[in-house]
Every structure is written in structure tokens, then in C-alpha cells.
């Protein structure tokens, strides 16, 4: 079989949900000594990066300015060391947001409930869309989908204190083009005193794994690079729609 290098890791810096006309940054983490990185979009070559000097960095950032629906979709990357190419990375779904209109998010029976109560979110958007998405802040990769003509329901079932947090919804014009986000709805779930005080609160900053962990080389890093890269590939779980 043809020899290949370990597959790189592709990540979106900050978030994979990029507002229209803003810049997206995708990181491709490969190997020290890689002379070329290629970013592929929907299976075709999109951009090429040749780091200078190649032995000093274990990956590159691809900058995609002026985000729009033509640049939203599935990305992957590969890299080359000498004449040897890597396997293709996992796919990364890049979404453009702030398209067209703003939905309204509401919650029933209300934003303050007790543990065990059944809660349903409603996302409404009067323009042409049939798919709606509900996201919890700090958990933006856990997207819930629902369908409806102008409104979609998101039944949460009996809630626990783990459901506490801020929620937003989007209307989706296709898998990769979403509306403006709704205003957030903060769900407060009260339980018994012990549970409430111990329940972790969700971070309001972007997902902690949505960062580019590119490093410059030291002597020790060079020795550990291949082992580290293989380990990260093994442990990295990636989001798919």
C-alpha cells in the first residue's frame, strides 16, 4: 500500500459559525517540516499554504475573509513533507450566519422551571425556511434540529439542573447558511439545594476546543512531534452535521 503521513487535524478558530462578511480562520495542524498545506472545500482544492521556514511550525492558519454562502460548507486539509502526502483530515462544517432574518425564541412553560418539569423551546421565523436549530451557549457543537413551516418545537423532556443556561435558535436556509441568532433565552432550573449548588454552570465563551494549537518547534518537540500528532488524532472527536 502507498505510504502516507498521519492525517492532520482541522479546526475552526473561535467558532465554526461565522457571521456573513466576517473572517473565518481554519487551522490545519500537521507536522513540523511540512512544506505545503492544502485546504479543500467540498472536495476541491480551495487554497494552498507553504510555510516559511517549514520546519518551524506544526501547522498553518487559512484565513477566509468576507464569509458568504458560497464559502460555507465542508472543509478538509492535507499536508506534504517532501514528496509524501498525508491522509485527508476529518471534515469540518463551516457555517455562515446572519443571513436574512432574525427568529424569535420562546420557552414553555417559562424560563424558570423546577427540576423534572417538561420544557419545550419554540423557534419562530416568518421567512422561507423549514429547518430550525437550537444551540446552548458553550455547547455550540451540540446542535438540535427541528422542522416546521414558520415555527419549530424543541421538546426537552423533564429537565435537570444540567439544562440551565442560555439558548439561542437559528433558522437554516440550508445546512450551512443560517439566519441571525435569536435573542438569548436563559433557562433557570431549580432543584433541591444540594443539586443546585453543585451543578456546573456552562461557560459563555466559545467552545474551549475551538482553538488553534499550533506550536513553534523546539528540540524536544521535534522528537515528540510524530507521537504527539498520532495521539491527538486518536483523541480528537470532530463534529459532523
Amino acid at each position: 500500500p502507498k505510504q502516507t503521513l498521519p492525517k492532520p487535524i482541522i479546526r475552526a478558530e473561535s467558532t465554526y459559525m461565522v457571521p456573513k462578511e466576517k473572517q473565518a480562520t481554519l487551522c490545519c495542524q500537521g507536522s513540523y517540516g511540512a512544506v505545503e498545506y492544502q485546504l479543500h472545500f467540498e472536495g476541491s482544492l480551495f487554497a494552498v499554504e507553504r510555510p516559511k521556514p517549514p520546519e518551524r511550525i506544526n501547522g498553518v492558519k487559512f484565513h477566509i475573509p468576507d464569509m458568504n454562502s458560497r464559502k460555507a460548507g465542508r472543509y478538509s486539509c492535507i499536508y506534504r513533507v517532501g514528496e509524501l502526502w498525508s491522509e485527508r483530515s476529518d471534515l469540518l462544517d463551516l457555517v455562515v450566519t446572519e443571513m436574512y432574518d432574525t427568529p424569535t425564541l420562546s420557552v414553555h412553560p417559562g424560563p424558570e422551571v423546577t427540576s423534572g418539569e417538561k420544557v419545550t423551546f419554540y423557534c419562530r421565523l416568518d421567512t422561507a425556511t423549514s429547518m430550525f436549530l437550537l444551540l446552548k451557549e458553550g455547547r455550540s457543537r451540540d446542535v438540535q434540529r427541528s422542522y416546521g413551516k414558520v415555527q419549530a418545537e424543541f421538546p426537552m423532556g423533564p429537565v435537570t439542573t444540567a439544562h440551565r443556561g442560555s439558548y439561542r435558535c437559528f433558522g437554516s436556509y440550508n445546512n450551512y447558511a443560517w439566519s441571525f441568532p435569536s435573542e438569548p433565552v436563559k433557562l433557570l432550573v431549580t432543584g433541591d439545594i444540594e443539586n443546585t449548588s453543585l451543578a456546573p454552570t456552562d461557560p459563555t465563551f466559545p467552545d474551549s476546543w475551538d482553538t488553534c494549537l499550533l506550536t513553534r518547534e523546539t528540540g524536544l518537540q521535534k522528537d515528540l512531534a510524530l507521537w504527539d500528532h498520532t495521539a491527538q488524532n486518536h483523541h480528537h472527536h470532530h463534529h459532523h452535521h
Partner: nanobody, 127 residues
Framework: QVQLVESGGGLVQAGDSLRLSCVAS????????MGWFRQAPGKEREFVAA????????YYADSVKGRFTISRDNAKNTVYLQMNSLKPEDTAVYYC????????????????????WGQGTQVTVSS
């Protein structure tokens, strides 16, 4: 925004050379990655060559590799495409494209990478 104007096209014989130029308006030319594309009658617009903002990286379509050379002069706000050993299949309208990228070593290959386009210049290669 940047305006792009191509020139240098014309009618040549197979085996001849041509140099296309693309002049960009504005004072921030050196912050733009540049590319050349072409479109033959009845065909999709296809990638030809690209150059990063400081010329560190160039990239070519397989069909022109070894025959075409892309270069740029940031002082003159101009990108060039030197076309040697032209073939009849190189006949097309050639378009210059530009986009803002923050890496010195990055180039775009896809049409969707570029947001700014010129009007094109016709190249016809007769056999």
C-alpha cells in the same frame, strides 16, 4: 474595494508568447492574494495560477505548469502572467482576481476564494 483591469491579450500563433498584465487600483495592493483564471467558450471558469501577497508562494494548474509564470510588482500594483509555448487549447478569456488574506504564504485556487474580479482579456491561439 479594489478595481482590476487586465490587458495584454490578443491573437497569436501556437508556440508564441504573451504577457498579460492586471493593474489594481488602491494603495493596499500588497495585502491582496492574486490569481489568474480563464474561461473558454461553453466551459466553466478554471484556475490558471496564483501568487501570494509577497510572492513567497506561487501555484499553477497542471495544464500550464512549466509554460506559464505568474509574478507581481507591488510597487506598480500589477500582477503578470507570462505565457510561453501557447497552445490552441489556451484560447480563452483570462480574468484577474484578488482577495485580502493575512498570510504572506497563502494563495487561492478556487473561484470562491476571490471576491474581486476584472472584466477579462481575450487570448486566441491559432494553430
Amino acid at each position: 474595494q479594489v478595481q482590476l483591469v487586465e490587458s495584454g491579450g490578443g491573437l497569436v500563433q501556437a508556440g508564441d508568447s504573451l504577457r498579460l498584465s492586471c493593474v489594481a487600483s488602491g494603495r493596499t495592493f500588497s495585502t491582496y492574494a492574486m490569481g489568474w483564471f480563464r474561461q473558454a467558450p461553453g466551459k466553466e471558469r478554471e484556475f490558471v495560477a496564483a501568487i501570494s501577497r509577497n510572492a513567497d508562494t506561487t501555484y499553477y494548474a497542471d495544464s500550464v505548469k512549466g509554460r506559464f509564470t505568474i509574478s507581481r510588482d507591488n510597487a506598480k500594483n500589477t500582477v503578470y502572467l507570462q505565457m510561453n509555448s501557447l497552445k490552441p487549447e489556451d484560447t480563452a478569456v483570462y480574468y484577474c482576481a484578488a482577495d485580502r488574506y493575512s498570510s504572506n504564504t497563502q494563495v487561492g485556487v478556487a473561484r470562491t476564494y476571490y471576491d474581486y474580479w476584472g472584466q477579462g482579456t481575450q487570448v486566441t491561439v491559432s494553430s
